[in-house]
Amino acid sequence: MASTGLELLGMTLAVLGWLGTLVSCALPLWKVTAFIGNSIVVAQVVWEGLWMSCVVQSTGQMQCKVYDSLLALPQDLQAARALCVVALLLALLGLLVAITGAQCTTCVEDEGAKARIVLTAGVLLLLSGILVLIPVCWTAHAIIQDFYNPLVAEALKRELGASLYLGWAAAALLMLGGGLLCCTCPPSHFERPRGPRLGYSIPSRSGASGLDKRDYV
C-alpha cells in the first residue's frame, strides 16, 4: 500500500515537472532585459526565449517575433531547443511507462515485471530532469558570466528570466518523481531464487517458536 502511494506521488510530481518543462521551454522568458531610458524610467523590456523574442514597450504594447532561420541561430540555442524537446519526449515516455507498471493498473500482471517497468520509468524521468537542467544551467551561467564581464556592452547584458526558475523547479520535480518511482521497487523483486521454492511448510524443530519457515531454502 505504501509503495502504491509513493508511485502515485512520484507520478504526480513527474506530471507537474513535465508541465513545468513544457511551459518553461515554450515561454520567451529565458533572458530578460530592462532597457532603462532617462534616469530610472524603463523604456522597454525585451524577453528572449528558445523560439521567439518579445519587446514590451512602456505603454504596455507587446510585439513578438519568432526566430526565422534555424541555421542562423546560435549553436547553444539550437542545443537548448533539442534538449528541451528530448526531455519532454523522454518524460512523457517515462510517465506512460510508469502508468503501465503502476501497482494500481492491470496492464501487467507479473509483480516482478511491474517493478522493473516502474524502475525504468523512474530512470527515464531522472534522465529527463537532467536533460532539462543542462540548457537551464548553461543559459543561467552564460547570463551571469556576461553580466559581470566588463568587456560586454550593456545591450548584451541580460538577467535571468522566469523560464529559468521554472525550468529548475520542473527539473527538480521530474528528478524527484523519478527518484520516488525508483524507490518504490523493493529489491526482492530482482533477486532470483537460489533454489527450488517448496510448496509446503517445514515444521519447526523447536516447537517453542511456533513459526513456520515458509519459502525456506
Epitope: I36, G37, N38, N149, P150, L151, A153, E154, A155, L156
Partner: antibody
Framework: EVQLQESRPELVKPGASVKISCKTS????????LHWVKQSHGKSLEWIGG????????IYNQKFKGKATLTVDKSSSTAYMELRSLTSEYSAVYYC????????????WGQGTSVTVSS | DIQMTQSSSSFSVSLGDRVTITCKAS??????LAWYQQKPGNAPRLLIS???SLETGTPSRFSGSGSGKDYTLSITSLRTEDAATYYC?????????FGTGTKLELK
C-alpha cells in the same frame, strides 16, 4: 596620477607587423579594461577592441578581427597591440585608453602612437 | 553597428557664444553616450558620460542632454581653450562607435 604611456612612433613596410605598447601606472592594472582606438589623419575615431587585464579576455571590432591582437603583461602593467599584414590604410595614430569603471566610456588615454606604413 | 552622426562638421564661433553640438544615433542608445574633446596633437579627453553627467574636471559651462537617438552638447559662454574637435561615442553596444566629429573654430 593615472598615466598611460605609449611606445614611440613606428615606420613599417607594407605587409609587415608592428607591436605597440601601452605602459600604465597610477592605478590597479587588473581592475580596469583597456581599449585601443585608431585615428587616421584628419579622421574620426575607430574602436579596435578591448582587453580585460585580469584574465586576458578580449573583444574586437569585427573590422579588426584577424588584423589586431591584444595582449597584456600583468607583471609590468603593460598592454600590447600587434597589427599584422599592414597596408597604407593602417597608417594612423593608435591610442590606448582605460575604460571608466561605471560606464563603457574611456576616461584616461595614452598620448598615441603614430604608425606609418610606407615602402 | 550603431552609426553616430554629427550633422555639423565645423562651426565658426566667437568668444562668449553659446554653442550646441548635436549627435544622432542610428538606433536608441538609452543615454549610453559620452562626449570627448580633442585638441590638435592631443588625445581625446572625456567630458561627459551617461549623456548628462559631467566628469571630474569638466567645466560647468559644458552640459549634455538628450535621450533615445538624439543628443546634444552645449557650451555656454565659449572660451579660447574650448576651440577643439568634439566627438560623441555610444557605449550601448559593441562595436563602440564614435561620431564624425564637430570642429569648433574661433572667428
Amino acid at each position: 596620477e593615472v598615466q598611460l604611456q605609449e611606445s614611440r612612433p613606428e615606420l613599417v613596410k607594407p605587409g609587415a607587423s608592428v607591436k605597440i605598447s601601452c605602459k600604465t601606472s597610477g592605478y590597479t592594472f587588473t581592475e580596469y579594461t583597456l581599449h585601443w582606438v585608431k585615428q587616421s589623419h584628419g579622421k574620426s575615431l575607430e574602436w579596435i577592441g578591448g582587453i580585460n587585464p585580469n584574465n586576458g579576455d578580449t573583444i574586437y571590432n569585427q573590422k579588426f578581427k584577424g588584423k589586431a591582437t591584444l595582449t597584456v603583461d600583468k607583471s609590468s602593467s603593460t598592454a600590447y597591440m600587434e597589427l599584422r599584414s599592414l597596408t597604407s590604410e593602417y597608417s594612423a595614430v593608435y591610442y590606448c585608453a582605460r575604460r571608466a569603471i561605471t560606464v563603457y566610456a574611456m576616461d584616461y588615454w595614452g598620448q598615441g602612437t603614430s604608425v606609418t606604413v610606407s615602402s | 553597428d550603431i552609426q553616430m552622426t554629427q550633422s555639423s562638421s565645423s562651426f565658426s564661433v566667437s568668444l562668449g557664444d553659446r554653442v550646441t553640438i548635436t549627435c544622432k544615433a542610428s538606433e536608441d542608445i538609452y543615454n549610453r553616450l559620452a562626449w570627448y574633446q580633442q585638441k590638435p596633437g592631443n588625445a581625446p579627453r572625456l567630458l561627459i558620460s551617461g549623456a548628462t553627467s559631467l566628469e571630474t574636471g569638466t567645466p560647468s559651462r559644458f552640459s549634455g542632454s538628450g535621450s533615445g537617438k538624439d543628443y546634444t552638447l552645449s557650451i555656454t559662454s565659449l572660451r579660447t581653450e574650448d576651440a577643439a574637435t568634439y566627438y560623441c561615442q555610444q557605449y550601448w553596444s559593441t562595436p563602440l562607435t564614435f561620431g564624425t566629429g564637430t570642429k569648433l573654430e574661433l572667428k
